[in-house]
């Protein structure tokens, strides 16, 4: 009779993480008598995966009933596969011996490869806000995928970006891989509502890529433009001076009125109006009693926006002549009710 051969028909098996791997093995003869064992690895350091005779192997089940006398199918199933299970698995026939069984013949081995999905991409932006026209970097990271081949794309508001660098680690073979990409984005004044998207495509995702997003509202700072104007109000001796603070983001803003360099009033932007592009407008006014002044008055609107150095705009109030209208209020979308009489 021909000598027993151990047949492992599959040179390789590819299984998705979390699924069950079937490792096939058949013997060509019932003789010699003795058990089958499955190992990962072929050398002295090999790991026992299944022993027909004894042991505890909670993740392993046999495909057929090994207790049947004429059984020659020694295939096994390994449940809940993870990337750490990758390796070469050998079906080994032992010959019954005393006191110990003796290794008789091994199959050629089956390489188990594990497909693992990438984690949801995490996009992070710069630690500090930046202003329009500046270039900022965004990073995207995804981990735990296998095989190594992966595609990463960057988008800003649906438009694909080209200025980015991507690395997949490790360089060599591994049970699982990570991807890290850095994209450069030029900010514009209209970017408050913009989004940066990192898109990862992998064989395990079956054409449905994973996306990570970052809102540029977390990154951008649009500094305000200031306009100080004056109109006559109520009685002829009163002048309304307004400071229109336009197109700023984020909302955090503090305004100080200075009269001839002295602090007159400080207030925090509260009732702001939002523009279509996501920036804000705000207006503060000051009611000045001109009759109380002999000399001209220099009124300064000083704005500290989002912790940045203050910007200011001044207006010279002529008290010698009859006050005339020196501006209009058409750009203000909201009026405050802040009054200040100067006595």
């Amino acid at each position: 009779e021909e000598e027993l051969q151990v047949i492992q028909p599959d040179k390789s098996v590819l299984v998705a993480a979390g699924e069950t791997a079937t490792l096939r093995c058949t013997a060509t003869s019932l003789i010699p008598v003795g058990p089958i064992q499955w190992f990962r690895g072929a050398g002295p350091g090999r790991e026992l995966i299944y022993n027909q005779k004894e042991g505890h192997f909670p993740r392993v089940t046999t495909v057929s009933d090994l207790t049947k006398r004429n059984n020659m199918d020694f295939s096994i199933r390994i449940g809940n596969i993870t990337p750490a299970d990758a390796g070469t698995y050998y079906c080994v026939k032992f010959r019954k011996g005393s006191p110990d069984d003796v290794e008789f013949k091994s199959g050629a081995g089956t390489e188990l490869s594990v497909r693992a999905k990438p984690s949801a991409p995490v996009v992070s932006g710069p630690a500090a806000r930046a202003t329009p026209q500046h270039t900022v970097s965004f990073t995207c990271e995804s981990h735990g995928f296998s095989p190594r081949d992966i595609t990463l794309k960057w988008f800003k508001n649906g438009n694909e970006l080209s200025d980015f660098q991507t690395n997949v680690d490790p360089v060599g073979e591994s049970v699982s891989y990570s991807i890290h990409s850095t994209a450069k984005v030029v900010l514009t004044r209209e970017d408050v509502h913009s989004q940066v998207i990192c898109e990862v495509a992998h064989v395990t995702l079956q054409g449905d890529p994973l996306r990570g997003t970052a809102n540029l509202s977390e990154t951008i700072r649009v500094p305000p433009t200031l306009e100080v104007t004056q109109q006559p109000v109520r009685a002829e001796n009163q002048v309304n001076v307004t400071c229109q603070v336009r197109k700023f983001y984020p909302q955090r803003l503090q305004l100080t009125w200075l009269e001839n360099g002295n602090v007159s009033r400080t207030e925090t932007a509260s009732t702001v109006t939002e523009n279509k592009d996501g920036t804000y407008n705000w207006m503060s006014w000051l009611l000045v009693n001109v009759s109380a002044h002999r000399d001209d008055v220099k009124l300064t609107c000083q704005v500290e926006h989002d912790g940045q150095p203050a910007v200011s705009k001044s207006h010279d109030l002529k008290v010698s002549a009859h006050p005339k209208e020196q501006g209009s209020n058409t750009a203000a979308e909201n009026t405050g009710s802040n009054e200040r009489n100067i006595y």
Epitope: G43, P44, G45, R46, T88, G109, E111, E173
Partner: antibody, heavy 118, light 114 residues
Framework: EVMLVESGGGLVKPGGSLKLTCAAS????????MSWVRQTPEKRLEWVAT????????YYLDSVKGRFTVSRDNAKNTLYLQMSSLRSEDTAMYYC???????????WGQGTLVTVSA | DIVMTQSPSSLAMSIGQKVTMNCKSS????????????LAWYQQKPGQSPKLLIY???TRESGVPDRFIGSGSGTDFTLTISSVQAEDLANYFC??????????FGGGTKLEIK
């Protein structure tokens, strides 16, 4: 968590004997090959012996064959190294290691020092 | 026996620098059946036992920082630390883990931090 704790080291005269013990926990002991690796005073690492998984297969460095015996008690999750006819060149820190599945050493104990000196 | 030779025997680097150390085997560690190179790298910090970093020449062990990169094939192998950190002060050993016994180690490379 994989834990390997060696014991039994000490000072012994040339020609003497010593038995090292490695208590293992945190994994299915019987499913893994277990090894002894030593580190000489010059910091060189040297594989000494391995007890395979799934049978009674033992493997030895040529210079310790016939003098050292590796054994295991799967019920007690313990690996042993019986050393006899000790020589001065056996002086080393002896580490117990759980082998990876294809010949590397995945986990190491803290070691036990064996000094062979007259 | 397969002889493993490491170079340099020691090197001193500043934090943040890229570190490269080499390991050469006296015969090929490439298994033609599975195209894997049977080489491992270990880190041994002062007063501690060795710790596995890499096996099959480039497969990083779980939990090992990705600044440790193994490369090479056949008889020539490299361990690269892309940006060395203070905690990387250690001896680094290579080991051939081919089925052919005895398994052998290189003499080590001592990494010192400037």
């Amino acid at each position: 968590e994989v834990m390997l704790v060696e014991s039994g080291g000490g000072l012994v005269k040339p020609g003497g004997s010593l038995k090292l013990t490695c208590a293992a926990s945190g994994f299915t002991f019987s499913n893994h090959a277990m090894s002894w690796v030593r580190q000489t005073p010059e910091k060189r690492l040297e594989w000494v012996a391995t007890f395979g998984s799934g049978g009674s297969y033992t493997y030895y460095l040529d210079s310790v064959k016939g003098r050292f015996t590796v054994s295991r008690d799967n019920a007690k999750n313990t690996l042993y190294l019986q050393m006899s006819s000790l020589r001065s060149e056996d002086t080393a820190m002896y580490y117990c290691s759980r082998s990876g599945w294809d010949g590397w050493f995945a986990y190491w104990g803290q070691g036990t020092l064996v000094t062979v000196s007259a | 026996d397969i002889v493993m030779t490491q170079s340099p025997s020691s090197l001193a680097m500043s934090i943040g620098q890229k570190v490269t150390m080499n390991c050469k085997s006296s015969q090929s560690l490439l298994n033609s059946n599975n195209q894997k190179n049977y080489l491992a790298w270990y880190q041994q910090k002062p007063g501690q036992s060795p710790k596995l970093l890499i096996y099959f020449a480039s497969t990083r062990e779980s939990g090992v920082p990705d600044r440790f990169i193994g490369s090479g094939s056949g008889t020539d192998f490299t361990l690269t630390i892309s940006s060395v950190q203070a905690e990387d002060l250690a001896n680094y050993f290579c080991q051939q883990h081919y089925s052919t016994l005895p398994w052998t180690f290189g003499g080590g490379t001592k990494l010192e931090i400037k």
